[in-house]
Interface confidence: low
Amino acid sequence: QLTTESMPFNVAEGKEVLLLVHNLPQQLFGYSWYKGERVDGNRQIVGYAIGTQQATPGPANSGRETIYPNASLLIQNVTQNDTGFYTLQVIKSDLVNEEATGQFHVYPELPKPSISSNNSNPVEDKDAVAFTCEPETQDTTYLWWINNQSLPVSPRLQLSNGNRTLTLLSVTRNDTGPYECEIQNPVSANRSDPVTLNVTYGPDTPTISPSDTYYRPGANLSLSCYAASNPPAQYSWLINGTFQQSTQELFIPNITVNNSGSYTCHANNSVTGCNRTTVKTIIVTELSPVVAKPQIKASKTTVTGDKDSVNLTCSTNDTGISIRWFFKNQSLPSSERMKLSQGNTTLSINPVKREDAGTYWCEVFNPISKNQSDPIMLNVNYNALPQENGLSPG
């Protein structure tokens, strides 16, 4: 069966296309090419007589066509108007005609596209941005790239206008890009220069560093404040609610206990109109912010009731601390028989009674910290009586 094939099928404007003929019958008088899907004398391009090898132009001949003895038709310097169907009519020697129709499509060489934007400085979580790929051309595929990757699936990304427009709903700071659009048709492709978004955001809640709370007198206090923001945040400091300075860093040399208080960092973004603050408490003290665990010792841990006395001693290397005693979760002293001495380091019980048996511990503390000793068990026996509370030391 007579067939035609376009080589190539998709042709770039200005290039050439060859309409090849397959299964050409034998014993021919000649053949004729027509523009369109049917034989129409008014649209004949060229006729060819085999006997004379003579080509005769038809009404639709543009001067760019060449017919070959094998019936193939070459069209040079094609335009988009050449797109469409072409029909070959073969006139056999028995005067029976055969026809075959082929087609090709002419596409323009695409220019380098560009991206236009309705908002190049959007505000995070508030604004939407619409990118449009220019120019608008027919029979063109529009593709978008973000960070050199094809569009991710996201409800915030919407394509419209034949994929020519990319809309970002409710932009975030991570949407900076770069963005590129690519236009394609079957014969060419071109990509735009990258475009980046300047997403305005913040400030986020500021962070004050370092994280230390306690400082010793005479030290230098250097605090730095940072809040993620675009454009960068403007910072100011307040101490105990009183404005100090408009800087990102606060420096106070040779601090005293009077510098204790609440330090507020205020971050402001003049574009978004948003403000965020963080408050940090600073304590200037000679006291150790961490009190070591005290040691508890007893003159004896097993005593005879109504006869013996016992001394419990709480030892610590920390200074500027206070000591308190506990027995069965109760604060001591709890009776006339119990006495505290040597700055509460020693607890004396004289005489020891049955109800004094149990667990004792001491606690050392200052205004900012405290620590407890391990418990110690006091056993109280009575002569000629079974042992009570005969527990080993805790």
């Epitope: 129709t101 082929g102 087609q103 499509h105």
Partner: antibody, heavy 127, light 110 residues
Framework: EVQLLESGGGLVQPGGSLRLSCAAS????????MSWVRQAPGKGLEWVSM????????YYADSVKGRFTISRDNSKNTLYLQMNSLRAEDTAVYYC????????????????????WGQGTLVTVSS | QSVLTQPPSASGTPGQRVTISCSGS????????VTWYQQLPGTAPKLLIY???HRPSGVPDRFSGSKSGTSASLAISGLRSEDEADYYC???????????FGGGTKLTVL
């Protein structure tokens, strides 16, 4: 949803004829080239024939040339395969399939593939 | 015998990467692009890769195709049990003026 539904299969004696049909829906049928592919029981795929969107060109496997004819009726969204002089070795499930891109993407660099297939119709050639 | 040559079988364990080869000639793979199809048991074939390496919508990116000279290959990474199927390569043959398939590779997920 793009769908292809084959029909016309059945039992036929060697030397007999059968006409398969493939009804297309869910896409612009006249924009797409169509193919027939067959699969003998327990065997692999064998391409049978292809027809251009406008029926301007038709191609056949050597094994069926001169016996099978592919055609289409774009007004009815239907593809056909006329099978004559059937042989036992023509026994197979026959699938119709569409090209992945419309005819205007026909250059070989992208084109020759089949992206949507019918469920198949069984043709048994036996005496 | 098929114009395109594929190994009859391949296997792998879940999570593994498996590659299936397809060998042809200058008139098919050498001058035209390659297509890969997946056929699950009892179902019609499905387009997996076209134009050597392009994945249609809905095909996981675990599947990838490549071509070099007159050979092509299909790679499946992160193998899953549902990948157990027959896989076919295909290409237009300019000499035969026909579309040709490979003999198919049966992939078993162990």
């Amino acid at each position: 949803e793009v769908q292809l539904l084959e029909s016309g299969g059945g039992l036929v004696q060697p030397g007999g004829s059968l006409r398969l049909s493939c009804a297309a829906s869910g896409f612009t049928f006249s924009d797409y080239d169509m193919s027939w592919v067959r699969q003998a029981p327990g065997k692999g795929l064998e391409w049978v024939s292809m027809i251009y969107s406008g029926s301007s060109s038709k191609y056949y496997a050597d094994s069926v040339k001169g016996r099978f004819t592919i055609s289409r009726d774009n007004s009815k969204n239907t593809l056909y395969l006329q099978m004559n002089s059937l042989r036992a070795e023509d026994t197979a499930v026959y699938y119709c399939a569409k090209a992945p891109l419309p005819f205007y993407f026909r250059p070989k660099s992208y084109y020759y593939a089949m992206d949507v297939w019918g469920q198949g119709t069984l043709v048994t050639v036996s005496s | 015998q098929s114009v395109l040559t594929q190994p009859p079988s391949a296997s792998g364990t879940p999570g593994q990467r498996v590659t299936i080869s397809c060998s042809g000639s200058s008139s098919n793979i050498g001058s035209n692009n390659v297509t890969w199809y997946q056929q699950l048991p009892g179902t019609a074939p499905k387009l997996l890769i076209y134009a050597n390496s392009h994945r249609p919508s809905g095909v996981p990116d675990r599947f990838s195709g490549s071509k070099s000279g007159t050979s092509a290959s299909l790679a499946i990474s992160g193998l899953r049990s549902e990948d157990e199927a027959d896989y076919y390569c295909g290409s237009w043959d300019s000499s035969l003026n026909a579309y040709v398939f490979g003999g198919g590779t049966k992939l078993t997920v162990l």
